[in-house]
Interface confidence: low
C-alpha cells in the first residue's frame, strides 16, 4: 500500500533569463528512494540515482544543475521553458511516487519566486 | 552527522580574488555546490560540481568563478576572481545528504567586495 505523499513547490514563476530551483519532498512513507526522476513533459532533464549519483541529460547540461538535494535549479530560462515538470520518485518496496511544478517563465520583473531558501 | 564547515571569506576590493574551501564530512557525497545570500535577497544559487568533476556556474559568476571538488578529501572549492561589489553576499556550501527533503546548508562565510 502506498501511503506517501509527495510535496512541491508549486506552480511558480521567474523572470526570462534568470534561475529557478525546482524541488519535491516525499514525505509520510519509509520506502526507500531508489532513484529520482526530474521530466519537462515527455522529455528527462535529469537523474539522482542512489547509488550512482547525479546524471543529466547532455541537451540540458547547460542550463541544468544538480541540487541542493534532491531538487533541481534551472538557468537561462526562455519562456520556452514554462510548462509542467515533474519529479518522479522512485521507492522499495512503495513504487513510484509523481509530483508536478508548474512553472511559467515572465518577460517582466515582477515574477514572484515561489522557492525561497531561509537562512537555517 | 554530516557537518558542512566554510573558510575563505572576507574583505576585498573590487578587482580582487577569494578562495572559499568547504570542508564535508560524515559521508561521501554525489555533488557539492555553492550559494550565496545578500542583505534582503533570496539565496541564490551560485556553482555546482559532480564528484565527477563535471560544473555548472549561475550566468552571473560565469567566467569569473571557478568551482571545484578534491574528492580525496571530501572538499569543495570556489575560487572567485574578478569580484564585484554585488558579490558581496554570505556564501553558503551544501551538497545531498542522501534522499530526502532535509539536505545540508553550512553556516556560511561573509564575502565583502568593498573599496
Known amino acids: 500500500m502506498m501511503t506517501g505523499t509527495i510535496e512541491t513547490t508549486g506552480n511558480i514563476s521567474a523572470e526570462k533569463g534568470g534561475s529557478i530551483i525546482l524541488q519535491c519532498h516525499l514525505s509520510s512513507t519509509t520506502a526507500q528512494v531508489t532513484q529520482v526522476n526530474w521530466e519537462q513533459q515527455d522529455q528527462l532533464l535529469a537523474i539522482c540515482n542512489a547509488d550512482l549519483g547525479w546524471h543529466i541529460s547532455p541537451s540540458f547540461k547547460d542550463r541544468v544543475a544538480p541540487g541542493p538535494g534532491l531538487g533541481l535549479t534551472l538557468q537561462s530560462l526562455t519562456v520556452n521553458d514554462t510548462g509542467e515538470y515533474f519529479c518522479i520518485y522512485h521507492t522499495y518496496p512503495d513504487g513510484t511516487y509523481t509530483g508536478r511544478i508548474f512553472l511559467e517563465v515572465l518577460e517582466s520583473s515582477v515574477a514572484e519566486h515561489g522557492a525561497r531558501f531561509q537562512i537555517p | 552527522e554530516v557537518q558542512l564547515v566554510e573558510s575563505g571569506g572576507g574583505l576585498v576590493q573590487p578587482g580582487g580574488s577569494l578562495r572559499l574551501s568547504c570542508a564535508a564530512s560524515?559521508?561521501?557525497?554525489?555533488?557539492m555546490g555553492w550559494f550565496r545570500q545578500a542583505p534582503g535577497k533570496e539565496r541564490e544559487w551560485v556553482a555546482s560540481?559532480?564528484?565527477?568533476?563535471?560544473?555548472w556556474y549561475a550566468d552571473s559568476v560565469k567566467g569569473r568563478f571557478t568551482i571545484s571538488a578534491d574528492n580525496s578529501k571530501n572538499t569543495a572549492y570556489l575560487q572567485m576572481n574578478s569580484l564585484k561589489p554585488e558579490d558581496t553576499a554570505v556564501y553558503y556550501c551544501?551538497?545531498?545528504?542522501?534522499?530526502?527533503?532535509?539536505?545540508?546548508w553550512g553556516q556560511g562565510t561573509l564575502v565583502t567586495v568593498s573599496s
Open positions: 551544501t551538497t545531498d545528504r542522501g534522499y530526502n527533503w532535509n539536505y545540508d
Open positions: 560524515g559521508r561521501t557525497f554525489s555533488f
Open positions: 560540481v559532480l564528484r565527477g568533476g563535471y560544473t
